[in-house]
């Protein structure tokens, strides 16, 4: 029988350069693609190996975006939320939020669409 | 981890059709971006065609425009290649493709590292 599973929920401010192919990442959610139960907010579904986010290295698959150069990612439809980040400029600033695991007695399984990633 | 299984090839005369179907696992399927490639012997790995995550945004290689159209059922976890009017040159290995989410960078459809996870394929042959 697996243990209770919590999470540590963290804020960061991610500021990244486009590099030469973007931002290097992927997301999901929004208010027409719920990833998450409950949840139209924008997650972080990859990472592209050697993009500006796996450059930088602070944001990782499962984070939730917040907010976009200040402007809140919330109500948004999926593809806005695309094009609001592909519009976001040279440099762009991230409000994220982590989500780690923390077990608490024996070792549980992740599934996919967990939003930990 | 993403598995997906092709199925629907075979041997066909020239001007017949075919319906590939690619089954995807996972439950955020309705959240992938999904692609066709092929190879045929010799030569190296060409894009198809791709589809977006809601099925609204369909894109094609020149060669099949017109012949090939690529679906999607979310409810089933599966995407379609409908090919129309082959040709010999059609005669390849078509494998699926997918990544989840959608690039927030500008999107090539047929470049092969847009996509993460990858079927085994499924031959199709135009006598």
């Known amino acids: 029988m697996n243990g209770r599973v919590d999470y540590l929920v963290t804020e960061e401010e991610i500021n990244l350069t486009r590099g030469p192919s973007g931002l290097g990442f992927n997301i999901v959610g929004g208010t027409d693609q719920q990833y998450v139960s409950n949840d139209s907010g924008i997650y972080v579904s990859r990472i592209k190996e050697n993009g500006a986010a796996a450059l930088d290295g602070r944001l990782q698959e499962g984070d939730k975006i917040l907010s976009v150069n200040g402007q809140d990612l919330k109500n948004l439809l999926h593809q806005d939320a695309v094009d609001l980040f592909r519009n976001a400029g040279y440099a762009v600033s991230l409000r994220v939020q982590h989500r780690l695991q923390v077990q608490n007695g024996p070792i549980g399984h992740r599934g996919e669409g967990d939003p930990s990633g | 981890e993403v598995q997906l299984v092709e199925s629907g090839g075979g041997l066909v005369q020239a001007g017949g059709s075919l319906r590939l179907s690619c089954a995807a696992s996972g439950r955020t399927f309705s959240t992938y971006t999904l692609g066709w490639f092929r190879q045929a012997p010799g030569k190296e790995r060409e894009f198809v065609a791709a589809?977006?995550?809601?099925?609204?945004?369909?894109y094609y290689a020149d060669s099949v425009k017109g012949r090939f159209t690529i679906s999607r059922n979310n409810a089933k976890n599966t995407v379609y290649l409908q090919m129309n009017s082959l040709k010999p040159e059609d005669t390849a290995v078509y494998y699926c493709?997918?990544?989840?989410?959608?690039?927030?960078?500008?999107?090539?459809?047929?470049?092969?590292?847009?996509?993460?996870?990858w079927g085994q394929g499924t031959q199709v042959t135009v006598s």
């Open positions: 589809i977006n995550w809601s099925g609204g945004t369909t």
């Open positions: 493709a997918a990544v989840i989410g959608s690039t927030v960078d500008s999107y090539d459809p047929g470049d092969p590292l847009e996509y993460d996870y």
